[in-house]
Each structure stands twice: as structure tokens, then as C-alpha cells.
């Protein structure tokens, strides 16, 4: 008798998920000497252990602790770039500005970036058909809990001046329901973080509005100030300039030193 399978509203696990995670791990540890000690098979086993045989709506941060432990990584705490709704540009930026780091520039973020995964209760199978959607099904799903966990840890590690890149083309430039707004903002440590500096990226090249006056930015400023962290906001008007150096990373003026 064929076993009944739960149909979720979200897309299923990314095809070749185990192979992709393992391959990414190997590639990352080859490129980053400080992570060469990492055993990628153990990383995959810990990743798998976090969600396999578990109900995909009952995942906890605790489930990911073995993976967190294996993926422990020290990034310069004063060189952290957070982002919200503008991932590609943030990644272009850190590809050039090599001394700054997004979450996806760390091992754990790199492993999971753009991937979906989930299992099934009481079976060792990976569900490639469907996975829970955060809104329509449940928030405690494997993907959401993973990102909440790593995002919290990343924010907790930050110090000095922390930058966040925000999308000035969106109706809500700062969205308190985003991972940045719901997790990272609340886990910056006031005793370590002096300032949060927001970079509001303008879309149109003729745009000369001051988006730092946007009501959602004022809301962000209020949240941050209440946490005893200074807030700064800058309008960034020429995002096409980021590509200057992506195309020519060898250009000496594309480093942090000018």
C-alpha cells in the first residue's frame, strides 16, 4: 500500500541537495585556509541530522546545534554586512570589498544559500516533492529555523560599526518582518556594537530623494536607538558602480584602501 505523503505549499528539497551541500563544503574549505580543518562529511551528517526523520513543522534551533558547532567560524566582527531584500548586490559588494562579510560569505551561509530542504517524520527520506511554506504552512520548518539560527549567531558576533544594505526600491525599505528586522536587529549586542549604519540603495539613476527620511527608516532608527546603539543612514545612488570592480577585481583601487 503506497504511504500517504504530506503535501506542503512550498517547493520541495532542491534536487541533488546532499551532493550540493557536500560539494559546497569542499569548495569552501579549499578556498578558505582557516576552515581547512573542517571535515565535510561530518558537516553533512550534522546538517542531515537536523531535519531527517523529524516533522518539518517541528524543527528547533537545538536541532541545528551540532551543525553550528562544526561550522563555528571567526569573521572580523567589525566587518559585517547585513542585508535585507537586496541579496545579490550585497554579495557583489563583498566579492569586491573582500574584507567585509555577509552571512553567505561564511561556511554555513554558503552551504545553504538559495537551497530548500525538508524531511518527513519517522522516515529517513528527503522530501523532494514539497516543503512547508513559512506563511501558508508553518514557521518552524527546516529552512526558516536554519536561517533564524545562523542569522542570530551572526548578529550576536558583530561589533563596532555594523553595516546593513537596504533596498530603496521597495515600498518597505525596512521591513520588521524580514530576517534582518525580526532577528538580526534584535540580536546586535549593545555592549559590542557602537553603530548600525544603513546603506539605502537607490534604484533609479535619476533618483535624488533622501530615502533616509522614509518612515520605515525612522522606525528602524527608533528600534536601534532604544537598544542603545547609534544609528546612521546613508543614501547610495549609483549601485551600477559596484560592477566596476566585480568585472575588474584586480584593479588596485577596488580594495578597501583608496
Amino acid at each position: 500500500v503506497p504511504r500517504w505523503r504530506q503535501q506542503w505549499s512550498g517547493p520541495g528539497t532542491t534536487k541533488r541537495f546532499p551532493e550540493t551541500v557536500l560539494a559546497r563544503c569542499v569548495k569552501y574549505t579549499e578556498i578558505h585556509p582557516e576552515m581547512r580543518h573542517v571535515d565535510c562529511q561530518s558537516v553533512w551528517d550534522a546538517f542531515k541530522g537536523a531535519f531527517i526523520s523529524k516533522h518539518p513543522c517541528n524543527i528547533t534551533e537545538e536541532d541545528y546545534q551540532p551543525l553550528m558547532k562544526l561550522g563555528t567560524q571567526t569573521v572580523p566582527c567589525n566587518k559585517i554586512l547585513l542585508w535585507s531584500r537586496i541579496k545579490d548586490l550585497a554579495h557583489q559588494f563583498t566579492q569586491v570589498q573582500r574584507d567585509m562579510f555577509t552571512l553567505e560569505d561564511t561556511l554555513l551561509g554558503y552551504l545553504a544559500d538559495d537551497l530548500t530542504w525538508c524531511g518527513e517524520f519517522n522516515t529517513s527520506k528527503i522530501n523532494y516533492q514539497s516543503c512547508p511554506d513559512w506563511r501558508k504552512d508553518c514557521s518552524n520548518n527546516p529552512v526558516s529555523v536554519f536561517w533564524k539560527t545562523v542569522s542570530r549567531r551572526f548578529a550576536e558576533a558583530a561589533c563596532d560599526v555594523v553595516h546593513v544594505m537596504l533596498n530603496g526600491s521597495r515600498s518597505k525599505i525596512f521591513d520588521k518582518n524580514s530576517t534582518f528586522g525580526s532577528v538580526e536587529v534584535h540580536n546586535l549586542q549593545p555592549e559590542k556594537v557602537q553603530t548600525l549604519e544603513a546603506w539605502v540603495i537607490h534604484g533609479g539613476r535619476e533618483d535624488s530623494r533622501d530615502l533616509c527620511q522614509d518612515p520605515t527608516i525612522k522606525e528602524l532608527e527608533s528600534i536601534i536607538s532604544k537598544r542603545n546603539i547609534q544609528f546612521s543612514c546613508k543614501n547610495i545612488y549609483r549601485p551600477d558602480k559596484f560592477l566596476q570592480c566585480v568585472k575588474n577585481p584586480e584593479d588596485s583601487s577596488c580594495t578597501s584602501e583608496i
Epitope: D207, S208, C233, K234, N235, R238, D240, K241, C245, I258
Partner: antibody, heavy 120, light 107 residues
Framework: QVQLVESGGGLVQPGGSLRLSCAAS????????MNWVRQAPGKGLEWVSA????????SYADSVKGRFTISRDNSKNTLYLQMNSLRAEDTAVYYC?????????????WGQGTLVTVSS | DIELTQPPSVSVAPGQTARISCSGD??????VYWYQQKPGQAPVLVIY???KRPSGIPERFSGSNSGNTATLTISGTQAEDEADYYC??????????FGGGTKLTVL
């Protein structure tokens, strides 16, 4: 090292035309916004025009809009400023300046300038 | 368009601290740049992004930007610092503006 060398300045009558050139070397020219900035004798700096990496975006100060045209030839590593309908108030040293990278919009490098004198 | 206002002149004794201000509406929302220009020479970038110093610029040059005012500070001013100083910002589109300039005199 980065070098910017302007040429093409000189004496021209009001209503006349002049074409300035800026030869760039020491960096990947096609990767940067380029600008013209001018300075009238004894006065401050005034931004004139900017052009994006591949020339698809151009902007001008109101004072020169409709009279000046900025362009670039990335194969020749050269920036140009075509100046038409020149007026006495256009008399200035014209500098070619290279933009800063990434989130910054200021001028990392400047040429030595070329003097344009508009007089009858 | 934002307008940047600088004092026409600032005087300082050698070894003392010189402060040059640059004011404009909500200037804190924009990165500010400072240039030094000596007679007959092209301007030189001394501060970018409010407070960053390009390589080769002495540590005595520093910058800040809060509220409506950006400030260039030269601590332990030397005779060779005598020059004109210009602030600059960019507020999008065709709005790249310079302040009127400040003549720094080292007494």
C-alpha cells in the same frame, strides 16, 4: 600609478566651441564613472558633468546643460568634453576626475587641468 | 538641491587644531568628501566617506559628519597644511555639489 592628462584648452571667442580630452592610464578606465570639474579664476570648484562606465548614463550641471556634451572612448582610455556656445562665465581651469569605487561618489584622482578662456 | 556652506577662512597657530565646518540640510544622510588645494595645483582628496583617510594622507587629518554639519579636523596643524579646503557631497542624479571653500591660514 593613476594618471589623468587633460588637453584641448585655449582661447576661444564667445559663442565658439572647444573640445577637451583627458587621457587616462594606470587603471581600468572602463570600470569607472568619469567627471569634469571646473574652477573659474579665483573661485571655487564646480562639478560640470559625469559619465558612467559604458556611457549609458550621463548627467550635467544646470549651468552647462544643452551646451556641453561628455563622452568617452574606452578603447582609447579617453574622456571628452565638447563645449559649444561658450560664454565668458565658462572661463575656468577644467579638470578631469575619476570617481571613487563602490558606495562612494567623490573624486579619488584629478588631472592637472587645462585652461579655457572665453573672451573676445 | 542641497547647498553646502563653509566659512570663507579659518586661522590656526602651528601645532594647534584647525576645524573647518561644512553645513547642509540633513547632511548626515550623505557621504562627505574633503579636498585640499594649494595655489596652482589640482585638488587632492584628504577625506572620503565622512571620515576615511586615503593612503598617503597624514593621520592628523580626520573627518566627522552628524546632524547638518560635517567637520574636517586637522590636529597639530603644520605650515604645509595652509591651503584651500573644499567639502563635497552627492545627492543623486545631477546633484553633485561642492562647498564654497575655506582658506586655511597657518599663523
Amino acid at each position: 600609478q593613476v594618471q589623468l592628462v587633460e588637453s584641448g584648452g585655449g582661447l576661444v571667442q564667445p559663442g565658439g566651441s572647444l573640445r577637451l580630452s583627458c587621457a587616462a592610464s594606470g587603471f581600468t578606465f572602463s570600470s569607472y564613472y568619469m567627471n569634469w570639474v571646473r574652477q573659474a579664476p579665483g573661485k571655487g570648484l564646480e562639478w560640470v558633468s559625469a559619465i558612467s562606465m559604458n556611457g549609458d548614463y550621463i548627467s550635467y550641471a544646470d549651468s552647462v546643460k544643452g551646451r556641453f556634451t561628455i563622452s568617452r572612448d574606452n578603447s582609447k582610455n579617453t574622456l571628452y568634453l565638447q563645449m559649444n556656445s561658450l560664454r565668458a562665465e565658462d572661463t575656468a581651469v577644467y579638470y578631469c576626475a575619476r570617481d571613487l569605487p563602490l558606495v562612494y561618489t567623490g573624486f579619488a584622482y584629478w588631472g592637472q587641468g587645462t585652461l579655457v578662456t572665453v573672451s573676445s | 538641491d542641497i547647498e553646502l556652506t563653509q566659512p570663507p577662512s579659518v586661522s590656526v597657530a602651528p601645532g594647534q587644531t584647525a576645524r573647518i565646518s561644512c553645513s547642509g540640510d540633513n547632511l548626515r544622510h550623505y557621504y562627505v568628501y574633503w579636498y585640499q588645494q594649494k595655489p596652482g595645483q589640482a585638488p587632492v582628496l584628504v577625506i572620503y566617506g565622512d571620515s576615511k583617510r586615503p593612503s598617503g594622507i597624514p593621520e592628523r587629518f580626520s573627518g566627522s559628519n552628524s546632524g547638518n554639519t560635517a567637520t574636517l579636523t586637522i590636529s597639530g596643524t603644520q605650515a604645509e597644511d595652509e591651503a584651500d579646503y573644499y567639502c563635497q557631497t552627492y545627492t543623486g542624479g545631477a546633484s553633485l555639489v561642492f562647498g564654497g571653500g575655506t582658506k586655511l591660514t597657518v599663523l
